[in-house]
Interface confidence: medium
Amino acid sequence: TLNSVLNSNAIKNLPPPLGGAAGHPGSAVSAAPGILYPGGNKYQTIDNYQPYPCAEDEECGTDEYCASPTRGGDAGVQICLACRKRRKRCMRHAMCCPGNYCKNGICVSSDQNHFRGEIEETITESFGNDHSTLDGYSRRTTLSSKMYHTKGQEGSVCLRSSDCASGLCCARHFWSKICKPVLKEGQVCTKHRRKGSHGLEIFQRCYCGEGLSCRIQKDHHQASNSSRLHTCQRH
C-alpha cells in the first residue's frame, strides 16, 4: 500500500511496479493522486505505483490488509491497504498493524499474553540452527499457538462461544462478534422477553455464569415494567 511504500522499513514489501498478482488478471487498480484511504491518511502520488490487487488479507504483506480502497466502494475491487495503527478504527484483527489487534472496534496494543505480533505464521522462534526470526511477512493474521490452545481471549473476534476461552462467551459488539466475559453475580444482564429479540442488540451481553440466573433486581420490583433492572443472581 502507499504508506508501506513510503515507509523505509517496508522496502522489502514493495509490490510489483506494474501488473497484478497471479490469479487476479486485470484487477490491478491505479492509484489516484492524493487518494484518501480508509486509514485516514493522505498519500503522495508515486510514479508507476499500482496498488496490489487481492482477495484476502493473507495475499498482502504484513503491514497491509485486503479491502476496497473507498468506503462503500466497489466490493469487487480490493487492494492491499496499509494496516491501521494504534487507536484507529478496525473491523478485524488483520486490519491492525503488527503488535496490535482489533478490540471493540479499535486497534490496541498486544501485550505479551495476548497476540504475539504475527500475521499468520506465529513462528517467532528460530528455525534450524540459524536463530533467525520470521521476516516481515510472517507477522499478523492469527493467534499465536498458545492462543490456539487457550482459545480466543477477551476482545478476540469469534463466531461462537466455543471459539472463546473459558469464562468468555461470543457476543455481538457493533458489527462483529467478540469474546466477552461471562457475567458474574450482581452484574447487569439482559432478560429477553421475546425469543430472538437479542438479535437487535448492538452491544450484546454474555449470559450469567454457572449457578446464576438473570432475574429482576429485588429493589427494582416496584419500578415500571420497562425500566426493570435485571442482574445475575444465585438460583
Epitope: 522489502k12 509490490p15 510489483p16 501488473g19 498478482a21 497471479a22 490469479g23 496490489y52 484476502e56 488479507d57 493473507e58 495475499e59 498482502c60 504483506g61 504484513t62 478485524r92 484483527h93 488483520a94 489487534y101 497476540f115 500475521i119 499468520e120 505464521e121 506465529t122 513462528i123 517467532t124 522462534e125 528455525f127 534450524g128 533467525s132 526470526t133 520470521l134 521476516d135 516481515g136 511477512y137 510472517s138 499478523r140 493474521t141 492469527t142 493467534l143 499465536s144 499457538s145 492462543m147 490456539y148 490452545h149 482459545k151 480466543g152 478476540s156 473476534v157 469469534c158 463466531l159 471459539d163
Partner: antibody, heavy 121, light 116 residues
C-alpha cells in the same frame, strides 16, 4: 501462465549431497510463499519445507531438519533445496510448489512436474 | 504434531455417483483470528503433479469444476464430488498446517478413487 521447472535431481550415494532448483515464471515470485513436497515411489505426498517471501523465514519437516536447507533468490525467481547427508528414505520425486498466499503456507496452487532424486549405493 | 486421517483409503465408484471423502485432524484447524479453517484438498493422477482443488475448507480453486465442494470445521472435513466423471478417478489428499509454533504442513495419507 504460471510455470515451475525443477532441476538438479539424479542418483546420489547415501551421505551425499544434491541441490535442487526451481525456476519460476508467470507470477510475482517475490510475493509468495514457496515450498517443496516429495513423493516416494508408490507412496503419498510428504511436505518437506517452506520459505516465506523475503527468504528470512523457513520451515522444515522433522524428517529433513538439519540436513536440508531451503532458500530463494527473488532476483532470479528461483527456489532452491540443498540436500545434505542424504539417506535411502529420501528417494522420491521432489515437487516445487507455489503457495496461494503471501503469509500462510499450506494451499499450494501451482506445482512443477517434479524431479526424481534416487539415493542408492 | 498434527495428524490428518483420511477415510476411506480407497473406494470404488461409478460415473455419476456422488462421492464423499472425509478428513479428520488431530487438532482443531479453526483459526480464531482469520476466522478460517486452513484445510486444502488436492487431486493427483498417476505420474502427474498434484492439483489444488479446494482451499480454506470450501473455496474452489481456479479452473476446478463446480462438482467439487468442500465443507467442515474444527477437526472434521469433507470433500464431495457431486457427480463423478471419468476424469475424476484419481487419488485425493487433504492437507493442513500444524498449529504449533512451526506451522508445519501435513498431508493426509490419500484416498484412491477407482472405477467400479
Amino acid at each position: 501462465e504460471v510455470q515451475l521447472l525443477e532441476s538438479g535431481g539424479g542418483l546420489v550415494q547415501p551421505g551425499g549431497s544434491l541441490r535442487l532448483s526451481c525456476a519460476a515464471s508467470g507470477f510475482t515470485f517475490r510475493r509468495y510463499v514457496m515450498g517443496w513436497v516429495r513423493q516416494a515411489p508408490g507412496k503419498g505426498l510428504e511436505w518437506v519445507s517452506g520459505i516465506y517471501p523475503s527468504g528470512g523465514s523457513t520451515v522444515y519437516a522433522d524428517s529433513v531438519k538439519g540436513r536440508f536447507t531451503i532458500s530463494r533468490d527473488n532476483s532470479k525467481n528461483t527456489l532452491y533445496l540443498q540436500m545434505n547427508s542424504l539417506r535411502a528414505e529420501d528417494t522420491a520425486v521432489y515437487y516445487c510448489a507455489k503457495d496461494r498466499y503471501s503469509q500462510v503456507h499450506y494451499a499450494l496452487d501451482y506445482w512443477g512436474q517434479g524431479t526424481l532424486v534416487t539415493v542408492s549405493s | 504434531d498434527i495428524q490428518m486421517t483420511q477415510s476411506p483409503s480407497s473406494l470404488s465408484a461409478s460415473v455419476g455417483d456422488r462421492v464423499t471423502i472425509t478428513c479428520t485432524s488431530s487438532q482443531s484447524l479453526f483459526n480464531v483470528r482469520s476466522q478460517k479453517n486452513y484445510l486444502a484438498w488436492y487431486q493427483q493422477k498417476p505420474g502427474k503433479a498434484p492439483k489444488l482443488l479446494i482451499y480454506d475448507t470450501s473455496k474452489v480453486a481456479s479452473g476446478v469444476p463446480s462438482r467439487f465442494s468442500g465443507s467442515g470445521s474444527g477437526t472434521d472435513f469433507t470433500l464431495t464430488i457431486s457427480s463423478l466423471q471419468p476424469e475424476d478417478f484419481a487419488t485425493y489428499y487433504c492437507s493442513s498446517r500444524d498449529n504449533s509454533d512451526n506451522h508445519l504442513v501435513v498431508f493426509g495419507q490419500g484416498t484412491k478413487v477407482e472405477i467400479k
